[in-house]
Interface confidence: low
Amino acid sequence: SIPWNLERITPPRYRADEYQPPDGGSLVEVYLLDTSIQSDHREIEGRVMVTDFENVPEEDGTRFHRQASKCDSHGTHLAGVVSGRDAGVAKGASMRSLRVLNCQGKGTVSGTLIGLEFIRKSQLVQPVGPLVVLLPLAGGYSRVLNAACQRLARAGVVLVTAAGNFRDDACLYSPASAPEVITVGATNAQDQPVTLGTLGTNFGRCVDLFAPGEDIIGASSDCSTCFVSQSGTSQAAAHVAGIAAMMLSAEPELTLAELRQRLIHFSAKDVINEAWFPEDQRVLTPNLVAALPPSTHGAGWQLFCRTVWSAHSGPTRMATAVARCAPDEELLSCSSFSRSGKRRGERMEAQGGKLVCRAHNAFGGEGVYAIARCCLLPQANCSVHTAPPAEASMGTRVHCHQQGHVLTGCSSHWEVEDLGTHKPPVLRPRGQPNQCVGHREASIHASCCHAPGLECKVKEHGIPAPQEQVTVACEEGWTLTGCSALPGTSHVLGAYAVDNTCVVRSRDVSTTGSTSEGAVTAVAICCRSRHLAQASQELQGSTSGSGLNDIFEAQKIEWHEHHHHHH
Amino acid sequence: QEDEDGDYEELVLALRSEEDGLAEAPEHGTTATFHRCAKDPWRLPGTYVVVLKEETHLSQSERTARRLQAQAARRGYLTKILHVFHGLLPGFLVKMSGDLLELALKLPHVDYIEEDSSVFAQ
């Protein structure tokens, strides 16, 4: 009796019909930039304020007949998905609609920009609580649209957008490609990527997560009590806008970075069949389906991290790729990956007062990716310690020598075209966990951080025989901050974090032979923050009598119990 | 058509004198860039977003827009300022011929110019 999509975004331990109270999202205002809407539809009546903003191009074609129900169709459905009485995600959220798409669902970059400016001015004139802006539209890559989204995001607004319905790399579209925007792809009831005619959901590194976007029941503009099923990444984005409204209503002080990390953390992991995506995009596309958190309290103690992939460097010999974290995230580690295996490693370096992750292509390589591990670590003081190539048989080592600093990640970078397979010792001396070990011809970079209560440990998983993939995961309660391979030899394609698992990829077994040089060790650095846990407990204690409704109060659970694997 | 010509005359007269007083040159070593949509059918040539450098004030945006109009009028082109941006990005939206892009890119304070393009409901 509950629509599949509402069931899907509900945490596994709960029932959707008891999980979405009428109050959900009530402290949040959601702006919708879309078509006109039917504001007196029973699903959204009294919940959506139609602003006087309108900036749309003329409809195409001489035979076009403006029909109100068609003009309102897209926006009405999405408003219903966000906040509809019956089929909405955040049943308490207030909405404001701006018309930037005409009756054919077409708009302009300039009209969208003026709409975003209108929202910013409204925010300045009458500051309210948290704002979410839903952009269920896409055009080609636009520097100016991305820039406007960045500015609005830096003003504290959460922007959520559709990844696009072009079965293509979302990075080729805007605002989907704007890093500050939360970009949402679409999945169906079987957790498969949505196919739309000959096309389908976009994918790739610019997508943050997926959400239900096929056969979504919502308000139909055909009549004030009609419902209809629609599909697309707009519907998926509307789900995430609703989830964001629920989260922000429960924790109005959340920053964009905190919200994004929570959306990722509470998503169902590894349920999407990646075979649908082009092979080269699978590793870049997040295997995440959005879900509501199991409770509104308790997330604060978690050390949240996410993986950010760079754009591809391109194949030129000296090409580099750079991955960056959001302004209020810390770069805790840096790794690299090349499909050809020809790379010269990676290093963390300062750029504009902030650390970035830079990967280096090698001669004959098809290009590399830089992979940043970006974490929320308040009051962190992180620095990079570098050891130049040792040139000695024992390999290069570097450790965190400052008092109170812990090792969160290791990177290695080499100038030689091929490290060869001179095997450095892979076992670090016992009792020295704060140490990175690498090839003697490589420079080694250790990310060392001091933050209240931060503790980290190194976990290794070595495979003596060559294998295409070696993984090592952090246990419950610990968060993966660093992921690297030992040794950094040429048959290792690279290392990257997927959720809480460190993945080291090697060349096809058949090409490496079965010498001992095929041995690969995946090295994970797992951290947790005792300080965050303590602060969270204190916060809960101090707010318990504040009268702020916990919109999920009836479903409180112990935090250590929850596991995020979907139906 | 007649109305349009009337407007054009007014523009030429009103802006020619003003243009002479705006002799600032663009900063040395910085060249503004032009961007347009990679998907040809989605392009909307004839409308451009002129984005100015980050710290540009509204008054400077308006002045730069007027300067573009004046210089265009001198060359016999009619332009129309559709919107002046402030609050998010400094700049303005202008309806003009693509022939004027080279001229517009040389205006002071200009960071980049982007041709307008279509967006679609998803």
Partner: antibody, heavy 121, light 112 residues
């Protein structure tokens, strides 16, 4: 005037099913949710669930999820509740009650007269 | 589920008395967007359907005598009958509609 008229009393054997109807008149059926409430002999009121006739959406209290099925026929302004696999615990008076479909009107302003269902072997 | 507890479960009073029934919820019923408490009071007489008296904790349903009043916010609510009339002897239920719907166990008001 506005009224909800329920079907008559039923006597059923354990394991059987029963379908109770609630005919609405005097108002626009689509504009109100229809709730069902159980009252066992000498006991209090227990909310079973509701149906929104305009959308067909239903919500149930978890205790009744596998017991009750709510449906509505808009053409004759009638809501139905079917109870399956009856046991003696299902012996009760069942009420339908309407709630205006609007943000803040989460109360039942008109009730049916009640239908007594007796389960006995 | 939100739990609702009413007290007392029964009470005896005389015509003309002032009577107070209380209802406590396990979590706040204040809707932070509408600033309304999603709590209603119903009266039920033997063999009859319940009748709505008060909604939003304190708003009287039309046609309900003004001797009935509701008050409270958050988790603590009260139904007051200022001067009992013979027709007021019945069972009274509170009901939350903040998260789905739950009734209190009822308070039976009898003639002393």
């Amino acid at each position: 005037q506005v009224q909800l008229v329920q079907s008559g009393a039923e006597v059923k054997k354990p394991g059987a099913s029963v379908k109770v109807s609630c005919k609405a008149s005097g108002y626009t059926f689509n504009d109100y949710w229809m709730h069902w409430v159980k009252q066992a002999p000498g006991q209090g009121l227990e909310w079973i669930g509701y149906i929104n006739p305009s959308s067909g959406f239903t919500k149930y209290h978890q205790n009744f999820k596998d017991k009750a099925t709510l449906t509505a026929d808009k053409s004759i302004s009638t809501a139905y509740m079917e109870l399956s696999r009856l046991t003696s615990d299902d012996t009760a008076v069942y009420y339908c009650a309407r709630q205006y479909d609007y943000d803040e009107d989460w109360y039942f302003d008109v009730w049916g007269q009640g239908t007594t269902v007796t389960v006995s072997s | 589920d939100i739990q609702m507890s009413q007290s007392p479960s029964s009470l005896s009073a005389s015509v003309g008395d002032r009577v107070t029934i209380t209802c406590k919820s396990s979590q706040s019923l204040l809707n932070s967007r509408t600033r309304k408490n999603f709590l209603a009071w119903y009266q039920q007489k033997p063999g009859k359907a319940p009748k709505l008296l008060i909604y939003w904790a304190s708003t009287r349903e039309s046609g309900v005598p003004d001797r009935f009043s509701g008050s409270g916010s958050g988790t603590d609510f009260t139904l007051t009958i200022s001067s009992l009339q013979p027709e007021d002897f019945a069972t009274y239920y509170c009901k939350q509609s903040f998260n789905l719907f739950t009734f209190g166990q009822g308070t039976k008001l009898e003639i002393k």
